[in-house]
């Protein structure tokens, strides 16, 4: 969201660094929330859950199938999706070489206790030429393909695993917890979950200047959600922001002074990284030492300042999950500048993509003042509107409080995400992007 100009340009394809032997990404244990999540139980051929496994007949993948049972081809849909994506990457990286799977689902007890191989969530992979010098890069490609945990486990293979299909963490979208606070124009703060159309909240423009912007709607809203949030903490000043992996946060360029404002770079478009200006990063890619923008009081003046990230941890919160959208596309949550957008790591693209939505909202506001809160059918609320409000959403979309709200991802967001999956490379989309059903 937000700062279109000044918040960057199209990134060049990043240089991929191979994993080192015994390295794993993310740098947490495999069966923790931040990686593939807990073991859910062995799946055998005659168990009820066996139907959760699907065979992978991708001709671009070589399956070793040493058991001659076809077991290595069986995996969960999520594992299959990531593996198929990786197969393409491998062929692009090394023409003439294919992805090779040495172990998939295992029914023979060849692995350690509670191995994710037993539930079809893990694969051991090599390149078809079994060239050991390629394995570090193969592991990196697996990370980029969206596997939830990748481990350069053996000199003879890479181990990759995914979250369970029904895992909360597997479908994290891009949100803040309901306990997060925003600053209101009339003074004071408000919990993000309590926002309603008409509220004007603190945001920042494309030059990094603070301003108040209209809260339009929730792009995603799930009151009962229990999600895994990245906890990003700064020390000076001490601030703490929780947001899901796929949400965007603005990071200062290396040369940004400790006192300056976010500097504008010429041209518009998404962040480029480097010294051109602040760039939007997925929360899951923010690292300690990088600097985010926080509100600071200086000489009675409120302004944005870069603050070094002290720690990035994970926390499971049951406070619901909310993705507020402002007209500006940015928002200050817990005094930290964040994008309103998630899933796509190109902030200004996302902001432009929502232009039709903002325009429609503005038109409706002009035509029916005080009636542009997101409508449902019946169901009143504490703001004007009632049953005769102008509906700005498709049925079933996420609604603002007091608007006959039904939870979920906004239909416009879902539409854009679907288009994005067709048009954008996987690098631009976060692997934990949307709670779309597996087909």
């Amino acid at each position: 969201c937000g700062p279109g100009r000044g918040f960057g340009k199209r990134r060049h394809p990043k240089k991929l660094t191979p994993l080192a032997y015994k390295q794993f990404i993310p740098n947490v244990a495999e069966k923790t929330l931040g990686a593939s999540g807990r073991y859910e139980g062995k799946i055998s051929r005659n168990s009820e859950r066996f139907k959760e496994l699907t065979p992978n007949y991708n001709p671009d993948i070589i399956f070793k199938d040493e058991e001659n049972t076809g077991a290595d081809r069986l995996m969960t849909q999520r594992c299959k999706d990531k593996l198929n994506a990786l197969a393409i990457s491998v062929m692009n990286q090394w023409p003439g070489v294919k992805l090779r799977v040495t172990e998939g689902w295992d029914e023979d007890g060849h692995h350690s206790e509670e191995s994710l191989h037993y539930e079809g969530r893990a694969v051991d992979i090599t390149t078809s030429d079994r060239d050991r010098s390629k394995y570090g890069m193969l592991a990196r490609l697996a990370v980029e393909a969206g596997f939830d945990w990748v481990y350069y486990e053996s000199k003879a293979h890479i181990h990759c695993s995914v979250k369970a299909e029904n895992s909360v963490a597997a479908k994290s979208g891009g949100c803040f917890p309901g306990s997060a606070t925003v600053h209101l124009e009339q003074g004071g703060t408000k919990l993000v979950k309590d926002l309603s159309p008409g509220d004007r909240v603190l945001a920042a423009d494309d030059q990094g200047r603070l301003l108040y912007s209209d809260f339009l709607t929730f792009l995603d809203r799930d009151d009962g959600a229990k999600k895994v949030f990245y906890v990003i903490e700064t020390r000076e000043p001490r601030e703490r922001l929780l947001l899901t992996a796929a949400h965007l946060l603005f990071v200062a360029p290396h040369n940004d002074s400790a006192t300056g404002e976010p500097e504008a770079s010429s041209g518009s478009g998404p962040p480029s990284g480097g010294a051109l200006g602040p760039r939007a990063l997925f929360a899951s890619r923010v690292r300690p030492g990088q600097r985010v923008y926080v509100v600071a009081e200086r000489d009675g003046d409120r302004r944005l300042l870069p603050a070094a990230v002290h720690s990035v941890t994970l926390s499971e919160e049951a406070a619901g999950a909310y993705a507020p959208l402002t007209a500006q596309g940015t928002i200050l949550i817990n005094r930290v500048l964040a994008s309103c957008y998630a899933v796509i790591e190109e902030h200004s693209w996302a902001h432009r993509a929502f232009a039709p939505f903002r325009l429609a909202h503005a038109l409706l506001a002009a035509l029916a003042p005080a009636r542009t809160d997101r409508g449902g059918d019946s169901g009143g609320g504490d703001r004007g509107g009632g049953g005769g409000r102008v509906a700005l959403t498709a049925p079933g979309a996420a609604d603002a409080p007091g608007a006959g709200a039904t939870a979920g991802i906004h239909w416009y967001s879902q539409l854009l995400y679907q288009i994005g999956t067709w048009l954008l490379d996987s690098e631009a989309l976060h692997p934990l992007g949307m709670a779309v059903k597996s087909s």
């Epitope: 032997y21 070793k64 040493e66 040495t102 050991r132 000199k155 003879a156």
Partner: antibody
Framework: EVQLVESGGGLVKPGGSLRLSCAAS????????MNWVRQAPGKGLEWVSS????????YYADSVKGRFTISRDNAKNSLYLQMNSLRAEDTAVYYC????????????????WGQGTTVTVSS | SYELTQPPSVSVSPGQTASITCSGD??????ISWYQQKPGQSPVLVIY???KRPSGIPERFSGSNSGNTATLTISGTQAMDEADYYC??????????FGGGTKLTVL
């Protein structure tokens, strides 16, 4: 008890042939890759040949390629080494050894060895 | 063909640490196993996959493999550790190969 017992060694003239056998017991023979390793008198260990448990991969050292043939009979829990065109430099103690790796993607080292059988090639 | 180089002999006093090296091109790309062989006996696997110890092998035996050199370390060496030690390399595309062996003498 896990055991490997080699047999078939003896004295043979250069150019002659000999067939070594290795009888396995106490483990699931078909699940293991099997090897022949030799040791010339006063010298070090030299790997000769391997028969993988997986997909019947067979490997030979350059020094014996084309002359020696490894085979296995899982039904009989036996490993064999057919040695043809023997040379004086083939004189050694021949050991049979197992490995639970498949030699394609997994290797764990030879954890069980036989006592060896002596082959002497001399005119 | 691939070659592994070991020192012919290493001497150590009882209770001291003995280190036996094994060198070869890009050795860290390969898995190293170490074998102990006492006179008149068959070899015994003491380390596999660079650093792992089979059951029954004392904790004083340890292995490492980095760059072009693998090392077998015996801490608190005992007289019973006197033997020939062989390193052996494996990767998925090359045949097995043994080093020339190192005679460990416990003084």
């Amino acid at each position: 008890e896990v055991q490997l017992v080699e047999s078939g060694g003896g004295l043979v003239k250069p150019g002659g042939s000999l067939r070594l056998s290795c009888a396995a017991s106490g483990f699931t023979f078909s699940s293991y890759s099997m090897n022949w390793v030799r040791q010339a008198p006063g010298k070090g260990l030299e790997w000769v040949s391997s028969f993988s448990s997986s997909s019947s991969y067979i490997y030979y050292a350059d020094s014996v390629k084309g002359r020696f043939t490894i085979s296995r009979d899982n039904a009989k829990n036996s490993l064999y080494l057919q040695m043809n065109s023997l040379r004086a430099e083939d004189t050694a103690v021949y050991y049979c050894a197992r490995d639970r790796g498949d030699y394609v993607d997994y290797y764990y080292g030879m954890d069980v060895w036989g006592q060896g059988t002596t082959v002497t090639v001399s005119s | 063909s691939y070659e592994l180089t070991q020192p012919p002999s290493v001497s150590v006093s009882p209770g001291q640490t003995a280190s036996i090296t094994c060198s070869g091109d890009k050795l860290d790309y390969k898995y190293i196993s170490w074998y102990q062989q006492k006179p008149g006996q068959s070899p015994v696997l003491v380390i596999y996959q660079d650093i792992k110890r089979p059951s029954g092998i004392p904790e004083r035996f340890s292995g490492s493999n980095s760059g072009n050199t693998a090392t077998l370390t015996i801490s608190g060496t005992q007289a019973m550790d006197e033997a020939d030690y062989y390193c052996q390399a494996w990767d998925s595309n090359t045949p097995l190969v043994f080093g020339g062996g190192t005679k460990l003498t416990v003084l």
